[in-house]
């Protein structure tokens, strides 16, 4: 299709080389099409103008994204060629930063229902650059935490070193929805609730004598509880003896509950005691089996390919630890009779 009629928007993504960050592009179809099509400010059926130039589908995922190759080749379907880019409804998510993401991205509706719809498209020219200036050492992170029940704030990473007075007007989005009341480089939250968690996008306009472009940053905000004051507790094994059959394989599971810690480095491991000897066993990786705001349950198994007479004289010890302290639970194997 002919993209010369598409509305054009220029965006700049300046990424930090020190941290992982994501980026998003919204399919900003021209008003009033956008609102009807992508439900960003959804109109009720009564409000739909009679002669809307583009009668879009109500299916939120019914947009098609393309990349325009710089060599003039035909447009490429994003989904087929770029595994690190994911389409979610009307949004394009870039999972990894890098200058190779620079380029022109075009979005348009999948269903073309009238002649007017052909020109219903947006071309976004994205420029991606690594952050070079070290002048702002403490720029806000692209991952920010809000403590539940307290006051907090979300800072726009690309503007966090500027005072509120010098800061340009900022447009904020939360999970793709425009936050119309927020215009500063910082969103202040009087009391943090779990619904404040989400993906925030902050945009501001920068211009020079030739052109203007939108500078965008994405912030992943999570709501957290305060760090635990407790060492982890072992939920399983509960008993200190286990009946087993000689010569048969055996799996002993260790499940432990770790309270929330912002810097979370849980340790869960198995070791064996045999008379005055003690050694750690290489076992399958630990896995998280339940995660809530307050705590996480982690499991790690020890696998005995078969139980031997010697194993009946050994103790199998599960050891768990967090920054507060450690807990152990030992299991003695006992031969099943009859």
């Amino acid at each position: 299709f002919n993209i010369s009629g598409c509305s054009t928007k220029k965006l700049l993504w300046t990424y930090s080389t020190r941290s992982e960050e994501e980026f998003v592009l919204f399919c900003d179809l021209p008003e009033p099409q956008k609102s009807h099509f992508c439900h960003r400010n959804r109109l009720s059926p009564k409000q739909v103008p009679e002669h809307l130039p583009f009668m879009g589908s109500n299916d939120l995922s019914d947009v098609q994204w393309y990349q325009q190759p710089s060599n003039g080749d035909p447009l490429e379907d994003i989904r087929k060629s770029y595994p690190h880019i994911i389409q979610d409804k009307c949004t394009l998510h870039f999972l990894t930063p890098g200058v190779n993401n620079s380029g022109s991205y075009i979005c348009r509706p999948k269903m073309i229902k009238s002649p007017y719809d052909v020109a219903c498209c947006v071309k976004m020219i994205l420029e991606v650059k690594p952050q070079t200036n070290a002048s702002c050492e403490y720029s806000a992170s692209h991952k920010q935490d809000l403590l539940l029940g307290s006051t907090g704030s979300i800072s726009c990473p690309s503007l966090s070193c500027q005072s509120d007075a010098q800061s340009p007007a900022v447009t904020w989005y939360k999970n793709g929805k425009l936050l119309s009341v927020e215009r500063s480089n910082r969103i202040v939250v009087d009391e943090v609730y779990d619904y404040h968690q989400g993906t925030y996008v902050c945009d501001y306009t920068q211009s020079d004598t030739v052109s203007s472009w939108t500078v965008r940053a994405v912030v992943q905000v999570r709501t957290i509880v305060g760090d635990t004051k407790l060492k982890p507790d072992i939920l399983d094994p509960v008993e200190d003896t286990l009946e087993v059959e000689l010569g048969k394989p055996l799996t002993i599971s260790c499940k432990a509950r770790f309270g929330f810690e912002r810097v979370f480095n849980p340790v869960i491991k198995w070791y064996i005691k045999d008379s005055d000897l003690e050694w750690e066993v290489s076992v399958p990786e630990a896995k998280s089996i339940k995660s809530t705001l307050k705590d996480e349950i982690i499991e790690r198994n020890i696998i005995l390919e078969k139980v031997t007479q010697r194993d009946l004289r050994r103790k199998f010890v599960c050891f768990v630890q967090n920054s507060i302290g450690n807990t152990t639970q030992s299991v003695q194997l006992k031969e099943k009779r009859g």
């Epitope: 000689l246 010569g247 394989p249 050694w279 066993v281 076992v283 696998i303 078969k306 031997t308 007479q309």
Partner: antibody, heavy 120, light 110 residues
Framework: QEQLEESGGGLVQPEGSLTLTCTAS?????????ICWVRQAPGKGLEWIAC???????TYYASWAKGRFTISKTSSTTVTLQMTSLTAADTATYFC?????????????WGPGTLVTVSS | DVVMTQTPASVSEPVGGTVTIKCQAS??????LAWYQQKPGQPPKLLID???TLASGVPSRFKGSGSGTQFTLAISDLDCADAATYYC????????????FGGGTEVVVK
């Protein structure tokens, strides 16, 4: 008297295949025994290849043997080792061994070995 | 995979003497270690299991010790019948199963 005996060795062409058989006499492979294959190139040391748990049929291989070697329990008294894509480096005496069953993983009973020569 | 390193490759001692063979594991294997004796033209014979437990019928002149990553086989009061190659083997379970052998030590009795 408990014994193991290997058979099936001999001369094989490079890139060829061969199946070795380990036969037990005086006992059968009960559930707690593991039967394993170990090889020894002329004048060299012992090299573990693979084991099979007689009860569960679970198999264990040395990392270098995965893909080219397959251990199977074919009856209560026989275990085989299938070898494919053989090269001169596979020339060796192949031993089958039985572990200690309930008493552990060390190999308490060995066969006399069978010689495999890979040559054109 | 666990790698077993045996030293020395060869050792020569007179009848009545003592030989010490060392075996090092690339990771902590506790006491999951066996020692074997092999004479030319014969299959190996189990001497010691669990680093220090003598197999049945093995004379007490053979002594295994060590744990973790460092293991030793000592043969005292050497006899001509002890001339053979000795191998250590890791009999370690954990994630999967490993049964690696050391490179062997040839014992010559003068």
């Amino acid at each position: 008297q408990e014994q193991l005996e290997e058979s099936g060795g001999g001369l094989v062409q490079p890139e060829g295949s061969l199946t070795l058989t380990c036969t037990a006499s005086g006992f059968s492979f009960s559930s707690s025994y593991w039967i394993c294959w170990v090889r020894q190139a002329p004048g060299k040391g012992l090299e573990w290849i693979a084991c099979i748990a007689a009860g569960s049929g679970s198999t264990y291989y040395a990392s270098w043997a995965k893909g080219r070697f397959t251990i199977s329990k074919t009856s209560s008294t026989t275990v085989t080792l299938q070898m494919t894509s053989l090269t001169a480096a596979d020339t060796a005496t192949y031993f089958c061994a039985r572990d200690l069953g309930d008493d552990g993983y060390a190999y308490g009973l060995w066969g006399p070995g069978t010689l495999v020569t890979v040559s054109s | 995979d666990v790698v077993m390193t045996q030293t020395p490759a060869s050792v020569s001692e007179p009848v009545g003497g003592t030989v010490t063979i060392k075996c090092q594991a690339s990771q902590n294997i506790g006491n999951n270690l066996a020692w074997y004796q092999q004479k030319p033209g014969q299959p190996p014979k189990l001497l010691i299991d669990y680093a220090s437990t003598l197999a049945s019928g093995v004379p007490s002149r053979f002594k295994g010790s060590g744990s973790g990553t460092q293991f030793t086989l000592a043969i005292s009061d050497l006899d001509c019948a002890d001339a053979a190659t000795y191998y250590c083997q890791c009999t370690f379970y954990g994630s999967g199963y490993v049964a690696a052998f050391g490179g062997g030590t040839e014992v010559v009795v003068k």
